[in-house]
């Protein structure tokens, strides 16, 4: 059900930190904001759900990482990559990116100055 979380590599690296956190609440939070009218997303019903559940857990998870621009950017890139295939059109991709870049601010963190969210070989 869950990944094996072992001590591999440099434990202070952003990659290690991003791997340790649960980014699903962040993904759900953003999808809810851009797809709130749709009935289902994944196996979870987001139609009647307050976004604050996901946001609280999302912010808690992002807070677990060192609050550096690079680590925050890597987390946002990972979220983008995870959700890329679910975004149906260009407009949705742009909406998702907009919400994603607002995420650190919603959690009262510093937003990364430069963060390239073009992932998955340019598809997103």
């Amino acid at each position: 059900m869950r990944r094996e979380r072992g001590r591999q590599g440099d434990s202070s690296s952003c990659e290690r930190q991003v791997d340790r956190v649960n980014l699903k609440p962040c993904e759900q939070h953003i999808m809810q904001r851009i797809m709130g009218e749709q009935e289902q997303y994944d196996s979870y019903d987001i139609r009647s759900t307050r976004s604050s559940d996901q946001q609280q857990r999302c912010c808690d998870e992002l807070n677990e990482m060192e609050n550096t621009q690079r680590c925050m950017c890597e987390a946002l890139q990972q979220i983008m990559e995870n959700q890329c295939d679910r975004l149906q059109d260009r407009q949705m991709v742009q909406q998702f990116k907009r919400e994603l870049m607002n995420l650190p601010q919603q959690c009262n963190f510093r937003a990364p100055q430069r963060c390239d969210l073009d992932v998955s070989g340019g598809r997103c």
Partner: antibody, heavy 123, light 108 residues
Framework: EVQLVESGGGLVKPGGSLRLSCAAS????????MNWVRQAPGKGLEWVSS????????YYADSVKGRFTISRDNAKNSLHLQMNSLRDADTAVYYC????????????????WGNGTTVIVSS | EIVLTQSPGTLSLSPGERATLSCRAS???????LVWYQQKPGQAPRLLMY???TRATGIPDRFSGSGSGTDFTLTISRLEPEDFAVYYC?????????FGQGTKLEIK
């Protein structure tokens, strides 16, 4: 074997203090959020407090806010609950519980529990 | 604070029967953050279901979970003697992470 063992319970007078501990073994303690949950005699479960992996985020139930302090020592694989200004209503079995999440879908759950330590607040 | 209300308080059934336990939230809860636990006398709680409908490791398929928003259900299709216990729902999306008051499933 994955295990949580609570200690530090006992009899204390109202207004007194007690420090509970939870020793973790069989897993990488620093990779998990941890919780304290209590159960008063003959009553249901009551979530008390949670602490994230790095201790950066901490939450408390309203009933214990300002009186209880949760902490952890990742180097020693231990979780603590400092309980001050104890009241009769704090009498309960206190469980330490590990919180994990499903990596593919995201939900959180408490999958490993200790057997509990009993706290009795009485004059 | 999200209040979870479980019903019925006590459910008296016989082995082989179907049990339906309800958990109602005072505010909408994401399925992602709804968990069910089982507790037997003198024992620590045991994880049963998470994400409202996913069975935990080792939980038999006679247990199933469903629901969304404010109404969630735990169903045991055919009761076995070892299923008689107290069942709790919990939401863990928004602090404080509240539990329902429990439903006691007893042998009729």
């Amino acid at each position: 074997e994955v295990q949580l063992v609570e200690s530090g319970g006992g009899l204390v007078k109202p207004g007194g203090s007690l420090r509970l501990s939870c020793a973790a073994s069989g897993f990488i303690f620093s990779d998990y959020n941890m919780n304290w949950v209590r159960q008063a005699p003959g009553k249901g479960l009551e979530w008390v407090s949670s602490i994230t992996r790095s201790s950066r985020t901490i939450y408390y139930a309203d009933s214990v806010k300002g009186r209880f302090t949760i902490s952890r020592d990742n180097a020693k694989n231990s979780l603590h609950l400092q309980m001050n200004s104890l009241r009769d209503a704090d009498t309960a079995v206190y469980y330490c519980a590990r919180e994990d999440f499903d990596v593919s879908t995201g939900p959180y759950y408490m999958d490993v529990w200790g057997n509990g330590t009993t706290v009795i607040v009485s004059s | 604070e999200i209040v979870l209300t479980q019903s019925p308080g006590t459910l008296s059934l016989s082995p082989g029967e179907r049990a339906t336990l309800s958990c109602r939230a005072s505010q909408s809860v994401s399925n992602m953050f709804l968990v069910w636990y089982q507790q037997k006398p003198g024992q620590a709680p045991r994880l049963l279901m998470y994400g409202a409908s996913t069975r935990a490791t080792g939980i038999p398929d006679r247990f199933s979970g469903s629901g969304s928003g404010t109404d969630f259900t735990l169903t045991i299709s055919r009761l076995e003697p070892e299923d008689f216990a107290v069942y709790y729902c919990q939401q863990n999306g928004n602090s404080p992470y509240t539990f329902g008051q429990g439903t006691k499933l007893e042998i009729k």
